[in-house]
């Protein structure tokens, strides 16, 4: 993400996505994001925050678990898990409030 | 370049749910740069954020909404969607998905207007 | 919640004059996330200014954004016909995300 002077001290993050510019980025925070859509292997983004930070805040699902850290390459070596596959009426919602 | 299409229902019965998805072209959803956005808009009224969808299918919804609102993705539609249960004639408005990233919400639908009524 | 308040709720201006726009927060917003949008009628809204100061691709540089902490103005230095519209400030960087009431910027 471009992020103006103005906004605050950076710090940089690894970044492996299909969406990096290249191995590092930087940003207001570093994230590990772990996504598993329907029918497939979960699959580890890290990469750069500099927006909505209150996505840090949501708890684990079985569908995705966020991760974020606010020092040099701190995302580096975090390895995420999702959840345990639950029943309906103990599915928690991805909402982040 | 990037643009955004709502469809869905224009007219809803009062207790139903609402439904509307917004297509995404030129341009991909799964992108970690980008938050997925609706916003609607009473008539002759202000703008009302409703919420916000991330790739990874993360939400955060308006607290004022937050109780009847599910919006969803399909990353491999490039799509994502808003739910609206036991509407009202109050939820009568158009409705507008928007992209959003620190550079605010850059590309808008052209909006739906919905009607609420029997 | 950040409440946004935007003054005048009317402003009356002749092509040509200068236009003052102001977007007050309740409270300060989070890294300079405020935006200005215009909207006429039957359109959807157009992002003006990101980031307080910065404008969005196309916009031309009569538009100006400035302001920090909890106050914030949208100027339109010499205005054109085709800038007779709503426009409404917004923050975006912290949730829920919220717009101010709008301001109708009509022809005098």
């Known amino acids: 993400d471009p992020v103006k002077p103005s906004r605050g001290p950076l710090v940089t993050c690894t970044c492996e996505s299909p969406h990096c510019r290249g191995p590092t980025c930087q940003g207001a925070w570093c994230t590990v994001v772990l996504v598993r859509e329907e029918g497939r292997h979960p699959q580890e983004h890290r990469g750069c925050g500099n927006l909505h930070r209150e996505l840090c805040r949501g708890r684990p699902t079985e569908f995705v678990n966020h991760y974020c850290c606010d020092s040099h390459l701190c995302n580096r070596n975090v390895s995420l898990v999702l959840e345990a596959t639950q029943t309906p009426s103990e599915q928690p919602g991805t909402d982040s409030q | 370049q990037v643009q955004l299409q709502e469809s869905g229902p224009g007219l809803v019965k009062p207790s139903q749910t609402l439904s509307l998805t917004c297509t995404v072209s030129?341009?991909?959803?799964?992108?970690?740069?980008?938050?997925w956005n609706w916003i609607r808009q009473h008539p002759g009224k202000g703008l009302e954020w409703i919420g916000y969808?991330?790739?990874?299918?993360?939400?955060y919804y308006n607290p004022s909404l937050k109780s009847r609102v599910t919006i969803s993705v399909d990353t491999s539609k490039n799509q994502f969607s808003l739910k609206l249960s036991s509407v009202t004639a109050a939820d009568t408005a158009v409705y507008y998905c928007?992209?959003?990233?620190?550079?605010?919400?850059?590309?808008w639908g052209q909006g739906t207007t919905v009607t609420v009524s029997s | 919640e950040s409440v946004l308040t935007q003054s005048p709720g009317t402003l009356s201006l002749s092509p040509g004059e200068r236009a003052t726009l102001s977007c007050r927060a309740s409270?300060?917003?989070?890294?300079?996330?405020l935006a200005w949008y215009q909207q006429k009628p039957g359109q959807a809204p157009r992002l003006l200014i990101y980031?307080?100061?910065s404008r969005a691709t196309g916009i031309p540089d009569r538009f100006s954004g400035s302001g920090s902490g909890t106050d914030f103005t949208l100027t339109i230095s010499r205005l054109e016909p085709e800038d007779f519209a709503v426009y409404y400030c917004?923050?975006?960087?912290?949730?829920?995300?919220?717009f101010g009431q709008g301001t109708r910027l009509e022809i005098k």
């Open positions: 409270q300060s917003v989070s890294s300079s996330y």
């Open positions: 928007a992209r959003e990233s620190t550079d605010g919400m850059d590309v």
């Open positions: 030129g341009g991909s959803i799964s992108s970690g740069d980008y938050y």
């Open positions: 969808i991330y790739y990874s299918g993360s939400t």
């Open positions: 980031g307080v100061s």
């Open positions: 917004q923050q975006y960087g912290s949730s829920p995300i919220t």
